[in-house]
Structure formats: structure tokens, C-alpha cells
Interface confidence: medium
């Protein structure tokens, strides 16, 4: 089943997010991802936890998962690199770099996204865009076309309240509000984009979606700049 946890969003403008990737297992959408270099897609480490001996591929240039589109192309994965400290039972360090079998053919619908290197928190209240092919309602309906939603960043202190995530949000994580609008199952690994720059990656914990007391959790990419650079080098 798709991993992770867009509710309350709307269909995205087709191909307006050329960095968007669908990480697929045996031909089916599993997780979101974001093209960060010509041959590398960033996603969430937990996404491949259950991949076992399946075929992992990355779909780029897509709006619809099922319909033919000139820009769509499925790439094999040459190499999967989980963050060395990621573990199945925690949300920390939930990052994965996937090296494509070849450099992606770039164009208007396929383009890497600049990612944040300055390790500073995004200001609370900043509206950020999250997109994905994750479930769109609590019944688990999966969309065929890319969805997106704008979410305000939530300050860490609020997110760490006992009624919310009870201290689990480290400095390497960030939160966004989840009041009926939220990332949800199948969005994990996808990008949280603030001001045209990748700031976060949707974590793949089994969090309830759309509940304001359980904000969305995102891995701050700036906190992992050294690791990302070392893998891409």
C-alpha cells in the first residue's frame, strides 16, 4: 500500500511542478519524491521499508498516473541510499536518495528543484506548497492526477505540545498545520516547497491526517545538506 499520509487540496496545474516524482513499486504509486539533481530523486527512507524484492522505479514528468502524457517517463533505480541513521521505528532522518539509471531528460515538465541549504527554520505562518498523489479522503480514495495544498508552517513549540506531537519534533524536523487540509497516505517523500525552494520532505509515519492536533511532519532538508551533498558528489 502507498506509504505516508493530500486532504482538502485541489488538483494541481498540470506539469507546473516539474520537480515532482512518483516513486513506484511494481508499477504502482508508492510515495512522492522530488527531483533534486539530473540523476537524483529525494524521498523518504521509510517508503522502501516494505519494498522487499520488488521493482522500484521513478516516474517523472507526470500529472496523471494512468494517462499517456508526452513528458512522462519511468526510470529504473540504479541505487537507493537511505540516510544512515534512518530506522523503521522512528520518524527521524527519514530521507532517501534514489539514483536514476540515467540522467533525466529535462524539459518544461521535468526540472530539478533548488533545495534549502541555509539551516534556519522557516518562519511560522509561511505558506508552503505540498503536492502528491496521496489519498484525498478518509475513505482512502487515491487520485489519478497530482493534487496540492497550501499549508502554513507551524512553530515547533506548538507542534511539540503534549496534545500534539509531544516533544517528538527535533530541530531537524518541521511542522505544518493540518486542520482539514493536510498531506496524507501516499504523499510521503514528497516536497514541501516554500518560496520556490524545497524546505521539507513529507515523513512517512502513520500519523492521522487532517486533525489539527496532529500537524504534518516534514524533514528539513537544510539540516541534511552535508549528507545530500556527500551522496550526490
Amino acid at each position: 500500500p502507498p506509504r505516508g499520509r493530500i486532504l482538502g487540496g485541489r488538483e494541481a496545474e498540470a506539469h507546473a511542478r516539474p520537480y515532482m516524482a512518483s516513486v513506484q513499486l511494481n508499477g504502482a504509486h508508492l510515495c512522492g519524491g522530488v527531483l533534486v539533481a539530473e540523476q537524483w530523486v529525494l524521498s523518504a527512507a521509510h517508503c522502501l521499508e516494505d519494498a522487499a524484492d520488488g521493482k522500484v522505479q521513478v516516474l517523472l514528468g507526470a500529472h496523471s498516473l494512468s494517462q499517456p502524457e508526452p513528458s512522462k517517463r519511468l526510470y529504473d533505480v540504479l541505487r537507493a541510499v537511505p540516510h544512515p541513521d534512518s530506522q523503521p521505528d522512528t520518524i527521524d532522518h527519514d530521507l532517501l536518495l534514489l539514483q536514476l539509471s540515467e540522467k533525466a531528460t529535462l524539459g518544461p515538465a521535468v526540472r530539478p528543484l533548488p533545495w534549502q541549504r541555509v539551516d534556519r527554520d522557516v518562519a511560522p505562518g509561511t505558506l508552503c506548497d505540498v503536492a502528491g498523489w496521496g489519498i484525498v479522503n478518509h475513505a482512502g480514495r487515491r487520485p489519478d492526477s497530482l493534487q496540492h495544498v497550501l499549508l502554513p508552517v507551524l512553530d515547533r513549540a506548538t507542534c511539540n505540545r503534549r496534545t500534539h506531537h509531544d516533544g517528538a519534533i527535533t530541530e531537524r524536523l518541521m511542522c505544518a498545520e493540518s486542520n482539514r487540509r493536510d498531506s496524507c497516505k501516499g504523499d510521503s517523500g514528497g516536497p514541501l516547497v516554500c518560496g520556490g525552494v524545497l524546505e521539507g520532505v513529507v515523513t512517512s509515519g502513520s500519523r492521522v491526517c487532517g486533525n489539527r492536533k496532529k500537524p504534518g511532519i516534514y524533514t528539513r532538508v537544510a539540516s541534511y545538506a552535508a549528507w545530500i551533498d556527500s551522496v550526490l558528489a
Epitope: D50, A52, V56
Partner: antibody, heavy 120, light 112 residues
């Protein structure tokens, strides 16, 4: 609970045959590559064989020491793994472990093992 | 075949000490896909082996952070920062990059 339970071990004469079984439960067996690893009494671990999943055409690989004598197979409908051992030699005497292989190729779940003794 | 050589064969330690186990491969174990499939397993007396570290430095689920793996190419190390009683047993390195896959001969961690 994820579990692997081996059976079929026992005493067999040199040049004889034996078939080991491994019953898997608690996970989607059909999506995993599976292995046999053995350990001779008082010795270290030795990888024996691997069989991949259906999506990888049930591809098999063997250690040189057992090639052409041992055959690994699986029955996904029953969540069973097998090791058919023919032309057994005294050096095949060992504890045989059934082992699951995770996405990053590590051996993440091990059975408790079944003992094979090859002796005249 | 890739020969995996572990040193030392036996490692007597005091509880609380740091322990270091070396594993050297007879050739590079970088897979054609760029990953290095080097793992470490611990086998306690009378038990099946358990996975500690995969792809050189990734700790497996539930493995305490006192265990760390490092290395590249042909030289790899497992470090235990503060040895506890439950860490005693035989440690094996393993390469899964080149078939036939091979284990090291093992290192027995014991109390001094």
C-alpha cells in the same frame, strides 16, 4: 509476528538426499527474496542459496560448494521455502537457517534452524 | 570468491570499554549499482544471528546507537562505544555485493 520455522532436518548417509522446508508467517512472503544460510558445528556462517521473488522471475543463486547438488524453491501460495539437497557430503553437516532478505539486501529475519547430519 | 577476513578472532573487553572489530575484503565490494552491501551480524550463544548494521553504516531497527559501522572499498570497522553484557557473542561481517556472498570468520567478543 514475523516468523520463519524450518523443518526436515535429520540424519542422512553420504550421497543421500534430504528436503528442508521453511514455513513463513506474519509478512507478505511473495514479495521477499529468501535464503538459506548454514553453520557447521563450532564454525562460522556460510551463505548457501537465494531465490528471488516472482517480480524478479524467481532467479536463484548458489554458493559454489552446493552448486549442482542443492536446489532452492518456493511456493508463494503456501508461504513455503524449500531446499532440496542431493548427493550429500559429510561437510554438509550443519544447522540450516531460513532467512528473509530485506530491500537493502540484508538478512533481517532468521529462523531458529534445523539440524542436518551427514554420517555413515 | 570474495574472502572476508575478520580481526581479531577473539576480543576480550571489560564492560564499558570500547570495542573495535575489523573486516577486510579480498577485493572491492562496491556493487555495480554503487552501494556497498557490507553487513554486520551478532550471534549470541544458542541463538540465531541478528542483523546490526547494513550498507556499511546503517543501524538496523532497534539496534542501540552504541553500535556504529564505517569503512569503504575493502576495509570496514564495527565499533561498540560502551560494551554491555548483552553485546557478548560472535560478530560476523558479510558481503552481499558479489555472488557467491561470503561471511567473515567471526570475532568472539568476551569479558576480560
Amino acid at each position: 509476528e514475523v516468523q520463519l520455522v524450518e523443518s526436515g532436518g535429520g540424519l542422512v548417509q553420504p550421497k543421500g538426499s534430504l528436503k528442508l522446508s521453511c514455513a513463513a508467517s506474519g509478512f507478505s512472503f511473495n514479495t521477499y527474496a529468501m535464503n538459506w544460510v548454514r553453520q557447521a558445528p563450532g564454525k562460522g556462517l556460510e551463505w548457501v542459496a537465494r531465490i528471488r521473488s516472482k517480480s524478479n522471475n524467481y532467479a536463484t543463486h548458489y554458493a559454489d560448494s552446493v552448486k549442482d547438488r542443492f536446489t532452492i524453491s518456493r511456493d508463494d501460495s503456501e508461504s513455503m521455502l524449500y531446499l532440496q539437497m542431493n548427493n550429500l557430503k559429510t561437510e554438509d553437516t550443519a544447522m540450516y537457517y531460513c532467512v528473509r532478505q530485506g530491500y537493502y539486501w540484508y538478512f533481517d529475519v532468521w529462523g531458529t534452524g534445523t539440524t542436518v547430519t551427514v554420517s555413515s | 570468491d570474495v574472502l572476508m577476513t575478520q580481526t581479531p578472532l577473539s576480543l576480550p573487553v571489560s564492560l564499558g570499554d570500547q570495542a573495535s572489530i575489523s573486516c577486510r575484503s579480498s577485493q572491492s565490494i562496491v556493487h555495480s549499482n554503487g552501494n556497498t552491501y557490507l553487513e554486520w551480524y551478532l550471534q549470541k550463544p544458542g541463538q540465531s544471528p541478528k542483523l546490526l548494521i547494513y550498507t556499511v553504516s546503517n543501524r538496523f531497527s532497534g539496534v542501540p546507537d552504541r553500535f556504529s559501522g564505517s569503512g569503504s572499498g575493502t576495509d570496514f570497522t564495527l565499533k561498540i562505544s560502551r560494551v554491555e553484557a548483552e553485546d557478548l557473542g560472535v560478530y560476523y561481517c558479510f558481503q552481499g555485493s558479489h555472488v557467491p556472498w561470503t561471511f567473515g570468520g567471526g570475532t568472539k567478543l568476551e569479558i576480560k
